[in-house]
């Protein structure tokens, strides 16, 4: 805590400028009016203040706005934002997307800090849902943002926002998250024609059920192996050899290289060996000819 001392004669700051970098901590505290600082916050980013001086400037703003800074100040915090704690940020009411963008810009190119995570959380909660413009902004700065949300949080994403999602935004999503996103994507892209629809839905297919994969197999989509390997195992298992062949098209040859990995391995174990042989890929591990396959899950459902 900086002691309250009188400002030396002639040192009272009339504006926020570079002369202030020569002020000692106590001089900054005594000679810079907090209201002046608040109105000229945008100038701070062009002045090479020391870390200690930034602490003093933050302290002055904290005294002026004990309940939290107004948005007019927040928008111009610049690198002083990085001196804020999550507790400070929880006091803020950020409603403008421009303010959010300005603060995200400060940390651009670096992983999400606790300050940024708190800011985003406050902003999204304030809006009530993750609208398209917000999602656009957040994924532009943090491609992995969507996959950092819980399935519960993702449920508040309106289908219209899905248009803002790029394939790389889903790279780190797990199956539970894709389970939530896939139905939204299906709804968002429902009016597109076959090939265009597949291009858009492809990144979300890790959440697709069997019946949707069967439908896609009838549309000559030529799914690549990387996408196939991300499908839910439980959704792939019921597919027939013919359906997988149609789904993958010319990429079906890639199954051989993946035969020891899920979901291919588990799918092979469920197919008749003579059906697998029709692919001519030398896939082994299918059900030998002459064996009877009982679907116990169906039996349990009937009893």
């Amino acid at each position: 805590e900086v002691e309250k001392t009188a400002c030396p004669s002639g040192k009272k700051a009339r504006e926020i400028d570079e002369s202030l970098i020569f002020y000692k901590k106590w001089e900054l505290e005594a000679c810079v009016d907090a209201a002046l600082l608040a109105t000229q916050m945008d100038r701070v980013n062009a002045i090479p203040f020391t870390y200690e001086q930034l602490d003093v400037l933050k302290h002055k703003l904290d005294e002026l706005y004990p309940q939290g800074y107004p948005e007019s100040v927040i928008q111009h915090l610049g690198y002083l934002f990085l001196k804020m704690s999550p507790e400070d940020i929880r006091k803020w009411n950020v409603t403008s997307l421009e303010t959010l963008k300005a603060l995200l810009e400060v940390n651009k190119g670096h992983e999400m800090s606790p300050q940024v995570a708190t800011l985003i959380d406050r902003f999204v909660k304030g809006r009530g849902q993750l609208d398209k413009d917000t999602l656009d902004t957040l994924t532009a700065f943090y491609p992995g943002y969507l996959c950092s949300l819980s399935p519960e949080e993702l449920s508040s994403v309106p289908p219209s926002s899905i248009w803002a999602v790029r394939p790389q935004d889903l790279d780190t999503c797990d199956p539970r998250q894709l389970d939530v996103l896939y139905p939204k994507a299906r709804l968002a892209f429902q009016n597109m024609n076959g090939s265009e629809y597949f291009v858009k839905i492809q990144s979300f297919l890790g959440g697709a059920p069997t019946e949707d994969l069967k439908a896609l197999s009838q549309q000559n989509v030529s799914m690549d192996l990387a996408t196939f390997m991300k499908l839910r195992t439980d959704a792939v298992l019921p597919l027939t050899v013919a359906e997988v062949q149609k789904l993958l098209g010319p990429h079906v040859e890639g199954l051989k290289a993946e035969e020891r990995h899920r979901p291919v391995r588990d799918w092979i174990l469920r197919q008749r060996q003579d059906d697998l042989d029709t692919l001519g890929l030398g896939l082994q591990g299918g059900i030998p000819n002459g064996y009877l396959v009982l679907d116990l899950s169906m039996q349990e459902a009937l009893s």
Epitope: P48, T50, Y51, L54, D55, Y79, S113
Partner: antibody, heavy 119, light 107 residues
Framework: QVQLVESGGGVVQPGRSLRLSCAAS????????MNWVRQAPGKGLEWVAV????????YYADSVKGRFTISRDNSKNTLYLQMNSLRAEDTAVYYC????????????WGQGTLVTVSS | DIQMTQSPSTLSASVGDRVTITCRAS??????LAWYQQKPGKAPKLLIY???SLESGVPSRFSGSGSGTEFTLTISNLQPDDFATFYC?????????FGQGTKVEIK
């Protein structure tokens, strides 16, 4: 006067870990930011990481992100660099250097410690 | 990250010469640029900061200029002690990237 002394360098096998230290004196350590910069044999300078005075913010070069961790103990006036999953290309002299603010240059440097990653 | 490109990579000069080294940033860095001098086996030494401000104790024959993306370091009257490698570094972003260096050697 300002003094920065690095230690902890040595020969280490690829994939292993090493922790470098930098002991600071002659200035108020808790007031200033600290950086690690490295220089591979016969090559130029490469900035590695920075940590703000209070440890609240840390930034890394893409080449070390996820493998190296910068930290500091202000009570001991010491800066650290924890290096995991080391690779041959991490072989370099590692310098610690001070900055006084986000828009300040590196005004004081240590003499460096050599890290050799080799099997 | 901001890329810094220095030229030339090597410069041959004689004592008394005026030498100029150029540094170009991949995007505007305002005036947040420093120049360092490094001698073999030694740590770098800060010469100039904020593009043109001379660090305390550095001889006045060293000067810097430029802003935005184009910067120069000039040594007006090269001395025997000046033969070394010089680096520029931007500090406009938290990832403080260096140029690849310019070696000033005796002609």
């Amino acid at each position: 006067q300002v003094q920065l002394v690095e230690s902890g360098g040595g020969v280490v096998q690829p994939g292993r870990s090493l922790r470098l230290s930098c002991a600071a004196s002659g200035f108020t350590f808790s007031s200033d930011g600290m950086n690690w910069v490295r220089q591979a044999p016969g090559k130029g300078l490469e900035w590695v990481a920075v940590i703000w005075n209070d440890g609240s913010n840390k930034y890394y070069a893409d080449s070390v992100k996820g493998r190296f961790t910068i930290s500091r103990d202000n009570s001991k006036n010491t800066l650290y660099l924890q290096m995991n999953s080391l690779r041959a290309e991490d072989t370099a002299v590692y310098y610690c250097a001070r900055d006084r603010g986000p828009l300040w240059p590196l005004d004081y440097w240590g003499q460096g410690t050599l890290v050799t990653v080799s099997s | 990250d901001i890329q810094m490109t220095q030229s030339p990579s090597t410069l041959s000069a004689s004592v008394g010469d005026r030498v100029t080294i150029t540094c170009r940033a991949s995007q505007s860095i305002s005036r947040w640029l420093a120049w360092y001098q490094q001698k073999p086996g030694k740590a770098p030494k800060l010469l100039i900061y904020k593009a043109s401000s001379l660090e305390s104790g550095v001889p006045s024959r060293f000067s810097g200029s430029g802003s935005g993306t184009e910067f120069t370091l000039t040594i007006s009257n090269l001395q025997p002690d000046d033969f070394a490698t010089f680096y520029c570094q931007q500090y406009a972003s938290y990832s403080r990237t260096f140029g690849q260096g310019t070696k000033v050697e005796i002609k």
